[in-house]
């Protein structure tokens, strides 16, 4: 049985390809899924010579490898696109690369929002 999972209802949303895909560029996404299925947030990005290029953020459908992850942490060594998922509202705001081979942990903080 599932125990103590953080319910995910909303995630940070971002789409680098927003113009072509005719979506919003950024904001919040309310997660919708089938009854009895868990929902997650995710982030995906590229790292070109230390420069982080955000690809997408948003809601992610029930995926067992995302269960009970409170933080969004990618562990692949050097993929074309980094991916992480997590549970809990807006848990994909920050995302981290913690390579399995024991390289340095790199956490990406969102830029501060401008005062309104």
């Amino acid at each position: 049985s599932g125990r103590g999972e953080a319910e995910t209802r909303e995630c940070i949303y971002y789409n680098a390809n927003w113009e072509l895909e005719r979506t919003n560029q950024s904001g919040l996404e309310r997660c919708e899924g089938e009854q009895d299925k868990r929902l997650h947030c995710y982030a995906s990005w590229r790292n070109s010579s230390g420069t982080i290029e955000l690809v997408k953020k948003g809601c992610w459908l029930d995926d067992f490898n995302c269960y009970d992850r409170q933080e969004c942490v990618a562990t692949e060594e050097n993929p074309q696109v980094y991916f992480c998922c997590c549970e809990g509202n807006f848990c994909n705001e920050r995302f981290t690369h913690l390579p399995e081979a024991g390289g340095p942990e790199v956490t990406y903080e969102p830029p501060p929002t401008a005062p309104t």
Epitope: S1, G2, R3, G4, E5, E34, D36, K37, R38, L61, D62, D63, F64, N65, C66, Y67, D68, R69, V73, T75, F83, C85, E100
Partner: antibody
Framework: EVQLLESGGGLVQPGGSLRLSCAAS????????MSWVRQAPGKGLEWVSG????????YYTDSVKGRFTVSRDNSRNTLYLQMNSLRAEDTAVYYC???????????WGQGTLVTVSS | QTVVTQEPSFSVSPGGTVTLTCGFN?????????PSWYQQTPGQAPRTLIY???TRSSGVPDRFSGSILGNKAALTITGAQADDESDYYC??????????FGGGTKLTVLG
């Protein structure tokens, strides 16, 4: 290189117990959900149980609920399946499998045979 | 009780093309079930072929491809070879920590 090595299988009488282990190496065990899958002699594959990265969420196929318990020790890189009240129909090769994103089994062990017979 | 159905057996000539399917009794298979396919030869552990509907696992030849055909997941083998003779299993992830395997398809390569 990812390796999953099951152990603990053997011959047990109906009603008896066994504890299977799966020793993982070649990847960071704590970062991945894990699962047990079995195959009765001459039959197809059957999913048995799954456990999340922390061990906080565990799931079972209906036929083993209340009899089998899956657990993991992330400090020892080991997955376990405690099997109680064993029945003849639990006779199978038991495989442990690593779960990857998109909920699929990307690596499998070679399996350990459990025989339940009097 | 969810039942995942596959053709029990299938035959193909060497060099031919075969499509194995995977459906279930509760509706249509979609990408949200993350269909995956596994090959197994007698006495061996399963080998992962296709995951997330249509992504080939590393080292799998491009003769193997996955798709959704109508309301089923499908595995297509083009240019079948003798060593493709195996059992093939599909798996659907039903969500909430539950997977269901199909009964498997025994593929025979004729000749």
């Amino acid at each position: 290189e990812v390796q999953l090595l099951e152990s603990g299988g053997g011959l047990v009488q109906p009603g008896g117990s066994l504890r299977l282990s799966c020793a993982a190496s070649g990847f960071t065990f704590r970062n991945y959900a894990m699962s047990w899958v079995r195959q009765a002699p001459g039959k197809g594959l059957e999913w048995v149980s799954g456990i999340s990265v922390t061990g906080g969420s565990t799931y079972y196929t209906d036929s083993v609920k209340g009899r089998f318990t899956v657990s993991r020790d992330n400090s020892r890189n080991t997955l376990y399946l405690q099997m109680n009240s064993l029945r003849a129909e639990d006779t199978a090769v038991y495989y442990c499998a690593k779960v990857y994103y998109s909920s699929f089994f990307d690596y499998w062990g070679q399996g350990t045979l459990v025989t339940v017979s009097s | 009780q969810t039942v995942v159905t596959q053709e029990p057996s299938f035959s193909v000539s060497p060099g031919g093309t075969v499509t194995l399917t995977c459906g279930f009794n509760s509706g249509s298979v979609s990408t949200s079930y993350y269909p995956s396919w596994y090959q197994q030869t007698p006495g061996q552990a399963p080998r992962t072929l296709i995951y997330n509907t249509n992504t080939r696992s590393s080292g799998v030849p491009d003769r193997f491809s996955g798709s959704i055909l109508g309301n089923k997941a499908a595995l297509t083998i083009t240019g079948a070879q003798a060593d493709d003779e195996s059992d093939y299993y599909c798996v659907l992830y039903m969500g909430s920590g539950i997977w269901v395997f199909g009964g498997g398809t025994k593929l025979t390569v004729l000749g």
